[in-house]
């Protein structure tokens, strides 16, 4: 059985989660990648995905989530900006490879967002001040609806706060670094 571990990120409202998930260059460079949230006892829910085929470095934005796929370095960068307490929860990066089930890229991310604006939105607690000039635009990304039943065989630990956003609208904000650890079947 695969042991799924978590990396914990504690950030304040308004900060950005800026996560890097790396993958096997030759195998997955142009594959479609996705960012998912895992709620207790439920199948992972896709919040945003790259285009298909995935474009090199071209940002795809869905609400407050921004995905950038750097093909040459086998790197998916996930950012969730302007974090809210409700964004707290468990997340993961996956690669879509139909008809096979999605391939998880790394340790799941346990995001804990607390109240108390830090005054320095940006990635991690060490972030520099950022300037938002233009309201984020939203790119509608077409993501496959299937998820892997394997990922819910064992319920993840109870999250400190569930992310409760309507299915029709994603309200996630700045997400900082997500660490990926390969999961082997």
């Amino acid at each position: 059985a695969t042991k799924l571990t978590e990396e914990k990120y504690e950030l304040k409202e308004g900060q950005t989660l800026d996560v890097k998930c790396d993958y096997t260059l030759e195998k997955f460079a142009s594959s479609q990648k996705a960012w998912q949230i895992i709620r207790d006892g439920e199948m992972p829910k896709t919040l945003a995905c790259t285009e298909r085929p995935s474009k090199n470095s071209h940002p795809v934005q869905v609400g407050r989530i921004i995905l950038e796929d750097y093909h040459d370095h086998g790197l998916l960068r996930v950012r969730m900006v302007n974090l809210q307490v409700e964004d707290s929860g468990l997340y993961q990066c996956v690669i879509y490879q139909p008809p096979k089930e999605p391939h998880m890229l790394f340790d799941r991310i346990r995001l804990v967002v607390t109240k108390g604006f830090s005054g320095t939105p940006g990635s991690n607690e060490n972030s520099t001040q950022n300037v938002y000039k233009i309201p984020p635009t939203t790119t509608k990304a077409l993501c496959p609806l299937y998820t892997s039943p394997r990922t819910v065989t064992q319920a993840p630990p109870k999250s400190t706060a569930d992310v409760s956003t309507p299915d029709s609208e994603i309200n996630l904000t700045n997400v900082t670094d997500i660490i990926r650890v390969p999961v082997f079947n």
Epitope: L75, G122, Y132, D177
Partner: antibody, heavy 117, light 107 residues
Framework: EVQLVESGGGLVQPGGSLRLSCAAS????????MSWVRQAPGKGLEWVAN????????YYVDSVKGRFTISRDNAKNSLFLQMNSLRAEDTAVYYC??????????WGQGTLVTVSS | DIQMTQSPSSVSASVGDRVTITCRAS??????LAWYQQKPGRAPKLLIY???RLQSGVPSRFSGSGSGTDFTLTISSLRPEDFATYYC?????????FGQGTKVEIK
């Protein structure tokens, strides 16, 4: 071939201003974060500022906040650094660099900025 | 900010020698470390990214290892063109920060 060419450096008095430019070619400029990195004479490298693909976010190192402004013109494949209230400690070679998610993968040749009276 | 400490600050070596440079982060940066080579009057050149991945076009005598806080750049057999200053860069937390550099000199 990816190319980054900086210009606009020179000698300026303390308190003065200077605008650096970086002309990019050989890649889809509008798809990448871009940065300015500087190197004082005989010293190490220091990241100064970066800007998102569409210009909607900017980040700065603490020592230049409120004095420097990074901007870009995607239509002209150009990156800029407006430097105001210059100080002697800003004297350095300024490099334009492409952010590639986990590193700066391409750099320009640099342009020297000297702040002296 | 995350502080990066390189050692040694300089090293004298001969052609054919094996050279090892280390970089230590003030906090865990997972694998998000890059290595650069810089020659006098030139821009830095990316050698290694993600701690151990070789940038396209870089000779295989260069290799990187490590994760968390401790990282190493190794030049397996020094060539004349390898005499330069080497920098590490952490790309985990903003702002990205560089090590102070290691100068590889001719013995």
């Amino acid at each position: 071939e990816v190319q980054l060419v900086e210009s606009g450096g020179g000698l300026v008095q303390p308190g003065g201003s200077l605008r650096l430019s970086c002309a990019a070619s050989g890649f889809t400029f509008s798809s990448y974060w871009m940065s300015w990195v500087r190197q004082a004479p005989g010293k190490g490298l220091e990241w100064v500022a970066n800007i998102k693909q569409d210009g909607s976010e900017e980040y700065y190192v603490d020592s230049v906040k409120g004095r420097f402004t990074i901007s870009r013109d995607n239509a002209k494949n150009s990156l800029f650094l407006q430097m105001n209230s210059l100080r002697a400690e800003d004297t350095a070679v300024y490099y334009c660099a492409r952010d590639y998610g986990d590193s700066f993968d391409y750099w320009g040749q640099g342009t020297l900025v000297t702040v002296s009276s | 900010d995350i502080q990066m400490t390189q050692s040694p600050s300089s090293v004298s070596a001969s052609v054919g020698d094996r050279v090892t440079i280390t970089c230590r982060a003030s906090q865990g940066i997972r694998k998000w470390l890059a290595w650069y080579q810089q020659k006098p009057g030139r821009a830095p050149k990316l050698l290694i990214y993600a701690a151990s991945r070789l940038q396209s076009g870089v000779p295989s005598r260069f290799s990187g290892s490590g994760s968390g806080t401790d990282f190493t750049l190794t030049i397996s057999s020094l060539r004349p063109e390898d005499f330069a200053t080497y920098y590490c860069l952490q790309a985990h937390g903003f702002p990205w920060t560089f090590g102070q550099g290691t100068k590889v000199e001719i013995k």
